[in-house]
Each structure stands twice: as structure tokens, then as C-alpha cells.
């Protein structure tokens, strides 16, 4: 499912809980999302042993994924909740290409994988209703992304499999940097 | 395990750097937090470094404080210290795996004494 | 900014009691919720966390439980090495605080 169900039974002998609110949805939907992560993260780790190479050992490669900086807004020094939320929004629409290559790449956590990129759908809708500055949101564009997603997908075997783990674990780094920034709105 | 190291008598007003060391994994996989703890007091949060770049610190530490990052240490920068920073300095472990903050491997502590 | 506010400060007990401690925090957190307990000169060590789950080799006789605000942490049975200070520590915001970790509470024998 796209959207999370409530947090837990307790959700159902409380009829009168009030609705949630914006932030409390989209805080939701990132920990629905980052739960999802972490499953499809435990069949990657217990396929290969890339999870236990240090950040150095897999830093070169020329995936251009999205990552948090300074720049943005979104951490507690030089915090800016527009230009953030700008970052978070592009970021999320630049990580939905990935995500598809992402599709079929698992065995057992087939469903897990298409929920994870629904969510994410789900949860850039949430965040658009919440931002002011629409505008300075750029799209990517798609021939690009389709390009991208054919190289992706004619590697070799273990460059696919370190390609899968790189972009759970950025993504997983991505979403936590987004969920701090957002806490602090 | 981590050890903190760098702990030492100093004058107010001395600048001090005090360094978590790893051992038996890389530090750029986790999350990594300081804490304090004066004589006979509680623990006190400092602040984290999450990536290479990204930190958060408690409200008093800002401008003060400063942690940076290897792949094998982390340190924690220290100006202007006052009696009042006298205390045990822990470096602490936070796996990351998750987007709550909780501290699972903590080191044993350095004691920073700062006194004319 | 989020605050912490565990009591007691102190309690006695003896071996066998049943020993209950509070978290309250300044607005909610969900469930992002750790204890710790500390023995003179030792680091802490970490026993709870997500308000409910025991962390690795922890003794079945810590449990804990709450969620948004309150949150409690009971030892069913004290045993003599549980004498101890504990805190509480909240995971959900580390931002704009004067401190993650509630004040303690220091677990003495009667």
C-alpha cells in the first residue's frame, strides 16, 4: 500500500483521535517509506557483502544521486525551510527514476519494492501541497531518465547489484536528511 | 569498540580537541554523538554528525563545539572552555539503520578538567 | 524545543521489588524512545529503545512501554547488579534542544 496504515491497534479503540495534520502525515509516510528501505536493504545485504564496505570503498561510481548539502537549506546550520523544501521535493522527483530501475531487482520483496516507489509518489504529493515556491521545482527531464534507466540496466550482474545498494542506501540517507529538516518546519 | 582520547587538565580559555577512535568497523557507516557527564551530575548531549557534513548540536554548544569526520575517528573542538565544561566526554554510536536517534556502542570516556 | 522530564530523581528498593520509572516529554515523539542505565565510572549502556524493544543481551525483566508523551520503564523483579542511575533519551528531534537524555533516576537499595 501506498499510504501507511495507523501507527498501530490502538488506532482502532480510539474513535475520536483526531485526523492527522499535514506534517504528521508526511512524517509518517517518510518512516513508512524508510521501513520499506530497510526490508529490501536485508536481502541486498544478505545477497552480497557490499553493505559492509566502508562509504570510501563505494564511492566511485558515476551514479549522480541526490544528496544533501549545505547549501540547501535543510540542515540545522543555515537551515531555510523554503529552499529546503525545494531540495527535498527535486531530490525525491530526481530519486523516481532509480526507483523504477529498482523494479524487478528483488526476488522475495517484489511488492516491497513497487510499495516503496508508490509511497514515494504519494509522499512528493504530500510535500508539493506544502510548498509555496512550486515554481523553482525543476523536472527531470524524461528521455534523460529513460536513457539513464537502459545504461542502468545493460551493467553486469555485479555492477547491478552494487547499483541496487547504492541507491537504497543514498535514498535510506536522502529521506533520513529530509525527515530531520522537516521536524524542525 | 570506540575509545575517546584527548582528555586533559587546561587553563580556561584553551582551546582543547578530544578524538573517538574506532575499532573493528569503518565510522563512516554510523552516526556518531557526544555526550557529557559532570562530576555527580547526569548526561548531557552535545551534538552528532550524521554524513561527512551534516551536525546538530544542543542549543549551547553552537559556535563552541565543532565535531568532524574520518572514516576511522571523530573529533570533537572545544573554545572558550570554563570550569562549567569540566566533565567525562563519551563518544557514542548510533547505527543509522533507522530515523530515530539512540546510541547502542558508547566508548568509555575521557576526563577534560578545567581549572587555573 | 523538546525537554525531558523523568522522575523520580531517587528511589529505594530492595531485591525482588517491582521498580517503575517515568519519561515525560514536552510535546510528542512517537515512540522514539531510549533508556539507558549507567554504573558509577562506566559508560551508559543502552537497554531500550523505540520505547518497547530490549536491546541486544538485555534481561527479559526490563520492559518498557508509552508512546507521544509518557513513557515508563519497569524492572518486573530488581536484582542486586540493577542498582544503577537510568535514563531516558528522546530520538525523535536533535535540533533546537538543551538536551536529548531526561535528568535520571538513581536506583538505590533500601
Known amino acids: 500500500a501506498p499510504v501507511p496504515p495507523g501507527e498501530d491497534s490502538k488506532d482502532v479503540a480510539a474513535p475520536h483521535r483526531q485526523p492527522l495534520t499535514s506534517s504528521e502525515r508526511i512524517d509518517k509516510q517518510i518512516r513508512y517509506i524508510l521501513d520499506g528501505i530497510s526490508a529490501l536493504r536485508k536481502e541486498t545485504c544478505n545477497k552480497s557483502n557490499m553493505c559492509e564496505s566502508s562509504k570510501e570503498a563505494l564511492a566511485e561510481n558515476n551514479l549522480n544521486l541526490p544528496k544533501m548539502a549545505e547549501k540547501d537549506g535543510c540542515f540545522q546550520s543555515g537551515f531555510n525551510e523554503e529552499t529546503c523544501l525545494v531540495k527535498i521535493i527535486t531530490g525525491l522527483l530526481e530519486f523516481e527514476v532509480y526507483l523504477e530501475y529498482l523494479q524487478n531487482r528483488f526476488e522475495s520483496s517484489e511488492e516491497q519494492a513497487r510499495a516503496v516507489q508508490m509511497s514515494t509518489k504519494v509522499l512528493i504529493q504530500f510535500l508539493q501541497k506544502k510548498a509555496k515556491n512550486l515554481d523553482a521545482i525543476t523536472t527531470p527531464d524524461p528521455t534523460t531518465n529513460a536513457s539513464l534507466l537502459t545504461k542502468l540496466q545493460a551493467q553486469n550482474q555485479w555492477l547491478q547489484d552494487m547499483t541496487t545498494h547504492l541507491i537504497l542506501r543514498s535514498f535510506k540517507e536522502f529521506l533520513q536528511s529530509s525527515l530531520r529538516a522537516l521536524r524542525q518546519m | 569498540s570506540l575509545e575517546e582520547s584527548g582528555g586533559r587538565l587546561v587553563t580556561p580559555g584553551t582551546p582543547l580537541t578530544l578524538t573517538c577512535t574506532a575499532s573493528g568497523f569503518s565510522l563512516s557507516n554510523y552516526y556518531v554523538t557526544w555526550v557529557r557527564q559532570a562530576p555527580g551530575k547526569g548526561l548531557e548531549w552535545i551534538g552528532i554528525i550524521y554524513g561527512s557534513d551534516e551536525t546538530a548540536y544542543a542549543t549551547w554548544a553552537i559556535g563552541r563545539f565543532t565535531i568532524s569526520k574520518t572514516s576511522t575517528t571523530v573529533d570533537l573542538k572545544m573554545t572558550s572552555l570554563t570550569a562549567a565544561d569540566t566533565a567525562t566526554y563519551f563518544c557514542?554510536?548510533?547505527?543509522?539503520?533507522?530515523?530515530?536517534?539512540?546510541?547502542?556502542?558508547w566508548g568509555q570516556g575521557t576526563l577534560v578538567t578545567v581549572s587555573s | 524545543a523538546i525537554q525531558m522530564t523523568q522522575s523520580p530523581s531517587s528511589l529505594s528498593a530492595s531485591v525482588g521489588d517491582r521498580v517503575t520509572i517515568t519519561c515525560q516529554a514536552s510535546q510528542s515523539i512517537n515512540n522514539e524512545l531510549s533508556w539507558y542505565q549507567q554504573k558509577p565510572g562506566k559508560a551508559p549502556k543502552l537497554l531500550i529503545y523505540?520505547?518497547?524493544t530490549l536491546a541486544s543481551g538485555v534481561p527479559s525483566r526490563f520492559s518498557g512501554s508509552g508512546s507521544g508523551t509518557d513513557f515508563t520503564l519497569t524492572i518486573s523483579s530488581l536484582q542486586p547488579e540493577d542498582f544503577a542511575t537510568y535514563y531516558c533519551?528522546?530520538?525523535?528531534?536533535?535540533?533546537?534542544?538543551?538536551?536529548?537524555f531526561g535528568g535520571g533516576t538513581k536506583v538505590e537499595i533500601k
Open positions: 523505540r520505547a518497547s
Open positions: 533519551q528522546q530520538g525523535y528531534s536533535l535540533r533546537n534542544i538543551d538536551n536529548a
Open positions: 557514542a554510536r548510533d547505527d543509522s539503520s533507522d530515523w530515530d536517534a539512540k546510541f547502542n556502542l
